[in-house]
Interface confidence: low
């Protein structure tokens, strides 16, 4: 996925064969090639127009490879393949195409904020994270607790704020909000830190 | 203002099929649960059956379950009950009620329609 | 399922009365006790929600309380239109909802 400041195209990677590589060393590179390459070249390219790049393999049993792809190049086609290699012997996955901006990850909304209206409502907003290169959808998740009583829900919106009529009062509401690529597919972003607003008591 | 609108009842048969309707207008309909509540005569209130804003979530009293169905269409801000094998203990008014926005499901009736008469009679 | 039993049944009043009708939940049931009155041949009306908030639009002279098993709604002065059929309503456990079997509150 392409990490929300547009900078790094983030590829991990989760081998089935995880027993078999655990037992010996082995090294994981992404060869990956921008389409302005292509241009004139055949639908395959050639082994020699591949960049390469070192795979982090120390993450959670996956792997971790950045590829600089650069901001007006987001809507193209990005080729990539796996070469692992382990004990002597290459391991060559086939080749993958991504877009890039249908990949996009977020950065989680900034700047969360609860009030209540003059109406009696309370009012959840945020701010979109900035250097996102398209509108965002929005899931806003919130739980109401109310002594003993916990109750969870969540709404998918497009404005940056969300109304909550019919609030309990002397109760707790936790919010959290991430985001996504409104008109297309995407990677949900990580939730934003967790907030907590408490309504007066009758 | 909020508004709902109940039509659909009638007399029908026991055994035989009935379509209730609810029309909504004066809110976001699609952001609310909305639940049947129905009243024999003479009797007191008994919840029937309930959907979330996006029908991810549908419950039934016991009374009802397998006999009726709930659904919704939020493009044209209606609620409906099919009501099938009806017998003669489903007379009632049948209102539907609006619940809390935004998959809170199950908190209070708030409004309530002005009920549609539904008579199960050989 | 959680029961709940209203009492009185019925009760009669006169105008200026102050009156309570109470709710009991078979279990504790938090906060989550609504109130609803009914007039004759109309639908249902909002007035208590939350145990003790009071709907929008619904006159001061209502009120609720309680938490837990017991819930008490009481009219401080009773006023000609407040005689009608008043329900309580649980939201805690749910579904199924269930509703107390109703007080008939009728004119002295």
């Known amino acids: 996925w392409l990490k929300g400041d547009l900078k790094l195209f983030i590829c991990y990677v989760e081998s089935l064969f995880k027993n078999l590589f655990r037992n010996y060393n082995y090294k994981v590179h992404l060869l990956y090639v921008l389409p302005e390459v292509l241009e004139d070249s055949p639908l395959v390219p050639q082994k020699g127009s591949f960049q390469m790049v070192h795979c982090n393999c120390s993450v959670h049993e996956c792997c971790e490879c950045l590829v600089p792809v650069p901001t007006a190049k987001l809507n193209d086609t990005l080729l990539m393949c796996l070469k692992i290699t382990s004990g002597g012997v290459i391991f060559q996955s086939p080749l993958m195409s991504v877009q890039p901006i249908n990949m996009v990850k977020p950065d989680p909304p900034l700047g969360l904020h609860m009030e209540i209206t003059d109406d009696g409502n309370l009012k959840i907003s945020w701010s979109s994270p900035p250097l996102v290169p398209f509108p965002l959808q929005y899931q806003v998740k919130y739980s109401e607790n109310s002594t003993t009583v916990i109750r969870e829900a969540d709404k998918i919106v497009s404005a940056t704020s969300l109304l909550v009529d019919s609030i309990l009062p002397g109760s707790s509401y936790e919010v959290q909000v991430r985001g996504k690529r409104l008109d297309g597919p995407g990677i949900w972003s990580d939730w934003s830190t967790p907030r907590v607003f408490t309504t007066q008591d009758v | 203002q909020v508004q709902l609108v109940e039509s659909g009842g009638g007399v029908v048969q026991p055994g035989r099929s009935l379509r209730l309707s609810c029309a909504a207008s004066?809110?976001?309909?699609?952001?609310?649960?909305m639940h049947w509540v129905r009243q024999a005569p003479g009797k007191g209130l008994e919840w029937v059956s309930v959907?979330?804003?996006?029908?991810?979530?549908?419950y039934y009293a016991d009374s009802v379950k397998g006999r009726f169905t709930i659904s919704r269409d939020n493009s044209k801000n209606a609620l409906y009950l099919q009501m099938n094998s009806l017998r003669n203990e489903d007379t009632a008014v049948y209102y539907c009620?609006?619940?809390?926005?935004?998959?809170?499901?199950?908190?209070?009736?708030?409004?309530w329609g002005q009920g549609t008469l539904v008579t199960v009679s050989s | 399922d959680i029961q709940m039993t209203q009492s009185p049944s019925s009760l009669s009043a006169s105008v200026g009365d102050r009156v309570t009708i109470t709710c009991r939940a078979s279990?504790?049931?938090?906060?989550?006790l609504n109130w609803y009155q009914q007039k004759p041949g109309k639908a249902p009306k909002l007035l208590i929600y939350?145990?003790?908030s009071l709907q929008s639009g619904v006159p001061s002279r209502f009120s609720g309380s309680g938490s837990g098993t017991d819930f008490t709604l009481t009219i401080s002065s009773l006023q000609p239109e407040d005689f009608a059929t008043y329900y309580c309503?649980?939201?805690?456990?749910?579904?199924?909802?269930?509703f107390g079997q109703g007080t008939r509150l009728e004119i002295k």
């Open positions: 959907i979330s804003y996006d029908e991810s979530n549908k």
């Open positions: 004066g809110f976001t309909f699609s952001t609310y649960g």
């Open positions: 309503q649980q939201s805690y456990s749910t579904p199924p909802i269930t």
């Open positions: 279990q504790s049931i938090s906060s989550y």
């Open positions: 939350a145990a003790s």
């Open positions: 009620a609006r619940d809390r926005p935004f998959g809170l499901v199950t908190g209070w009736f708030d409004p």
